[in-house]
Interface confidence: low
């Protein structure tokens, strides 16, 4: 081995040293303060005056380009002159109710001019009026037990569905395909308000007036509606707005609970199917449609003015140039657009890719550049459908596919304060284990342990005893276009609640005027530990990444997910012994394929053992066979009806988008196989999805093969 | 080299409304990517932004004067105009069209001004 | 809006001398800053940019200083031909974009 070797792995430790001790809370805490002081909504003024703060910004902490990337995309925005509401209405057509037009601005924020009403982004116009039908949280199975258990048809109804369980996107686009005219969404007590805590300002709950905008898209991976697979720069072809991807058909709006108390206390039709269809507000929860007794004839309305406009939107790339690798890029983003103050999302998040920039520009100043180019990245539109980040990435997925090592993604760093959350890849759970093992626990009761010891405890793995839990890589997130389209190994980490003990959707005040700078100060994170934990993890895998001489990625834990995926979707199969018997479906052939990945791995790893590190050739070889394994399991042609979603391990659920899906070609062609027209036809997309993942899973193993 | 020049009546009446352009010669708007923007100039209330406009049709105004303000911008013969409707004798100022420093870099300092033209609200 | 407070108002200074002109925000604007100069009939020109760096054409005796909420225009050795109104401006919170009052300096 070479002698030089223990020398380069002392300042490799001693540098990550520097870069970690250099991270200070009080600087996110500073930085969370100025990025929070007005509204950052896509597509504003506002949000420009940051991109350009952080542009001057980086380059004064060190950076060798920054750079504006603009886009013109897609957005939609409230009429200002013409608000959206929904009103009761009887039967002469008078309005007897209205919803609020606007939430209460929170203490010290009165005078703050540009928050943007509650909206459902990307909702069309339309004024729907007609019968209520309450959906539950409006998912698949909903649906199903309405339509097929209960009997009860939404074809022309206005219906309304509590947030929460899956992406609102995926609600919206279940109830269109249920028939319905309009849709309204709520905060549900049940879902946002958490049990002996106060409302904002005084705790960190939902108040009654509080509501959750958001975008209600379904894109899948597309980015801008109206440019998808291309950058939304000024040579693109744009389709006409009846072709654009993704859009939703019907109205939509959301409201907060003390309106939905209004439309949901008279409603009529039956008793909710079962206790999980009860929220928390003092209504019957009966299911419509329509209104009951004396209320019968009157009809809710919706009046709906919003508008889409292609509008310019502003990335912020900071390049910090690699002294040895430079045609390697290890890239940390997180986007900037927030739908009003942004307090957590994403703000809790910019903030420590701002210290992290900070730190990493400190070193270079001081002569210690990375071993690979780190690419920083300030997003835009991530609220309208992660198009920053996709507009980016078409636009330099040649670079990005040949010379993409790795994304982490730097959304909030909080959504609680109770454990670590980490979703990844397979090639970076032993990278998260080991660094996680190195940094010391924020958690009281943990002083002197490591964050591995306390999120191991308070988050332990389903599946390996002593181990903590890693979640497979859904969507919803800037991470998207990178894993699920280019294959590029991705990563993201934050604070969590207590899933056991609290169970509310996302954090109470999620996309709220009420998610504010002193929501984090006073109830999340007063000392700002929780955010440096994160930004020591989000750091440390940027750092290793960026640094290690052999890349820490570990192929045998893809084999073992692997192995454990084919097993999961072998037993889902399974529950139809007959139809696998009579089309003779056989999962054979993926287990074999799997088998010998595992074979192969083994054997690379052993290899990688031997690798002498100071032959430049060898090591890149071997760090090439790694950086391109995330690549191997991207197929060109995309799932069926999701082109966008490439990758045959892993994509978003089809039923809910913030979800991941393991061999996701294959559980989509066996989702509600039993209730298809055509057996034969459906059996035989089974086989033909088995097939893919194992020609993938083959082929993956393959590059893992000594090259010559 | 890059020059603006402004023009548009001296004199306007209280209640109707003021039209001024700028012609920007020696530099295309499309292709310069430079952002152009108005400032008023009065002895009481000093210099003050009005508004900037970009090539896209992206518009930046002044909140004091967005709703009487438009920004408009043909880029085939190189001008820009600005409109402000019901003036008072409070827009009685001297106008200027600026041009906001380097390529991309947005709303920043004002490089390049024009010469400036009086306009008096009387009737 | 960030209000932007220049003193003092009025400085008399003989040629030669050093001129210190200073410009308060109310809020901080990093290094966003800008400084104008404007004679009498004429339209305003720029001196400075990102708080200290000249414009182009701009003499090395005028420099530029400060960061945050303090800011300072300097002329090293005055001349008479820098008898004009000067300007601070802030690009940082907008909108709208602010200036100063001004600081007329006038040459003895």
């Known amino acids: 081995k070479p002698s030089n070797e223990a020398t380069g792995n002392v300042s490799h430790s001693g540098m990550k040293k520097e870069f970690l001790h250099e991270l200070k809370a009080e600087n996110i805490k500073k930085f969370l303060y100025n990025f929070t002081r007005t509204p950052h909504l896509a597509g504003t003024q506002n949000n420009f005056e940051l991109a350009k703060q952080i542009h001057d910004q980086w380059k004064e902490f060190g950076l060798d380009l920054v750079e504006l990337s603009h886009y013109d995309v897609l957005l939609s925005y409230p009429n200002k002159t013409h608000p959206n509401y929904i009103s009761i209405i009887n039967e002469d057509g008078n309005e007897i109710f209205k919803t609020s037009l606007s939430e209460q601005p929170p203490p010290g924020y009165e005078n703050i001019s540009d928050v943007v009403p509650p909206y459902s982004a990307f909702s069309p116009q339309g004024t729907p009026e007609g019968d209520l039908v309450y959906v539950n949280y409006a998912r698949t199975e909903d649906f199903f037990k309405l339509e097929r258990e209960m009997k009860i048809s939404c074809s022309g109804k206005i219906v309304i569905a509590r947030y929460g369980k899956v992406f609102r996107g995926n609600m919206v686009k279940n109830a269109q395909l249920a028939g319905a005219k309009g849709m309204i969404l709520y905060s549900d007590p049940a879902d946002y308000f958490v049990p002996a805590v106060k409302s904002y300002p005084d705790g960190w709950n939902l108040p009654g007036g509080g509501v959750q905008r958001g975008n209600v898209l379904n894109l899948n991976g597309a980015g801008d509606p109206l440019t998808p697979g291309y950058p939304a720069n000024e040579h693109a072809y744009r389709h006409e707005l009846t072709n654009a991807v993704g859009l939703p058909s019907i109205p939509v709006h959301p409201i907060g609970y003390d309106d939905a108390q209004k439309l949901l206390e008279h409603m009529g039709g039956p008793a909710p199917p079962d206790s999980s269809w009860k929220g928390g507000l003092k209504v019957p929860y009966n299911v419509g449609p329509g209104f009951a007794g004396n209320f019968s004839t009157q009809k809710v309305k919706m009046h709906i003015h919003s508008y889409t406009k292609v509008t310019r939107i502003y990335n912020v790339i900071g390049t910090l140039k690699g002294a040895l690798e430079p045609d390697r890029y290890v890239i940390l983003g997180g986007h900037r657009d927030a739908w009003v103050f942004g307090g957590i999302d994403p703000q809790s998040g910019a903030a420590v890719v701002h210290e992290i920039v900070r730190s990493f520009g400190t070193l270079k100043k001081k002569g210690r550049r990375p071993r690979r180019t780190i690419l920083f990245a300030s997003w835009d539109a991530e609220e309208f459908g992660l198009l920053g980040s996709t507009e980016w990435a078409e636009e330099h997925s040649r670079l990005l596919q040949e010379r993409g090592v790795a994304y982490i993604n730097a959304d909030s760093s909080i959504e609680g304060n109770y454990t670590l959350r980490v979703d990844c890849t397979p090639l970076m759970y032993s990278l998260v284990y080991n660094l996680t093992k190195e940094l010391q626990s924020p958690d009281e009761g943990f002083e002197g342990k490591s964050l591995y010891d306390s999120w191991k405890e308070k988050s332990p793995s389903p599946e390996f005893i002593g181990m903590p839990r890693i979640s497979k890589l859904g969507s919803g997130n800037d991470f998207e276009v990178f894993f699920q389209r280019l294959g590029i190994a991705s990563g993201r980490a934050r604070y969590t609640k207590n899933w056991k003990t609290n169970k509310v959707s996302s954090y109470p005040l999620y996309h709220s005027v009420y998610e504010t700078y002193e929501l984090v100060v006073k109830f999340y994170d007063p000392t700002f530990k929780y955010h440096l934990t994160v930004a020591q993890v989000r750091g440390a895998m940027v750092f290793e990444l960026a640094n290690s001489i052999v890349l820490p990625f570990d192929c045998q834990s893809y084999a073992v997910a692997l192995k454990k995926y084919a097993d999961t979707i072998y037993n889902i199969s399974m529950k139809h012994p007959q139809e696998m018997k009579a089309y003779m479906i056989s999962f054979d052939s993926l287990f074999s394929a799997v088998n010998n990945f595992t074979d192969v791995a083994s054997k690379f790893n052993q290899r990688l053992q031997e690798l002498d590190k100071s032959n430049p050739i060898l090591l890149r070889i071997m760090n090439d066979q790694l950086m391109y394994l995330e690549r191997a399991f991207i197929d060109p042609l995309g799932l069926p009806g999701r082109p966008f979603y490439r990758h045959i391990i892993y994509a978003p659920s089809s039923h809910n988008k913030y979800a991941g899906e393991s061999f996701p070609g294959i559980y989509d062609a066996l989702f509600d196989i039993s209730s298809k027209v055509n057996a034969s036809k459906a059996w035989n997309e089974v086989k033909r999805q088995i097939s893919i993942a194992t020609f993938t899973v083959q082929a993956a193993a393959e590059t893992l093969r000594e090259v010559a | 080299q890059v020059q603006l020049q402004e023009s548009g009546p001296g004199l306007v009446k209280p209640s109707e409304t003021l039209s001024l352009t700028c012609t920007v010669s020696?530099?295309?708007?499309?292709?310069?990517?430079?952002?152009w923007g108005w400032i008023r100039q009065t002895p009481g209330r000093g210099l003050e932004w009005i508004g900037t406009m970009f090539y896209t049709g992206a518009t930046y105004y002044s909140p004091s004067l967005k709703r009487r303000l438009t920004l408009n911008m043909d880029t085939s013969k190189q001008e820009f105009t600005l409109r402000l409707t019901s003036v008072t004798a409070a827009d009685s100022a001297v106008y200027y069209c600026v041009r906001h420093r380097g390529p991309d870099s947005g709303l920043d300092a004002f490089d390049l001004w024009g010469h400036g033209t009086q306009v008096t609200v009387s009737s | 809006d960030v209000v932007m407070t220049q003193s003092p108002a009025t400085l008399s200074l003989s040629p030669g001398e050093r001129a210190t002109l200073s410009c308060t925000v109310s809020?901080?604007?990093?290094?966003?800053l800008a400084w104008y100069q404007q004679k009498p009939g004429q339209a305003p020109r720029l001196l400075i940019y990102?708080?200290?760096t000249r414009a182009t054409g701009i003499p090395a005796r005028f420099s530029g200083s400060g960061s945050g909420t303090e800011f300072t225009l300097t002329i090293s050795s005055l001349q008479s031909e820098d008898s004009a109104v000067y300007y601070c401006q802030q690009y940082n919170h907008w909108p709208p974009l602010t200036f100063g009052g001004g600081t007329k300096l006038e040459i003895k």
């Open positions: 990102g708080a200290s």
């Open positions: 020696g530099a295309s708007f499309s292709s310069s990517g430079y952002y």
């Open positions: 809020q901080s604007v990093s290094s966003y």
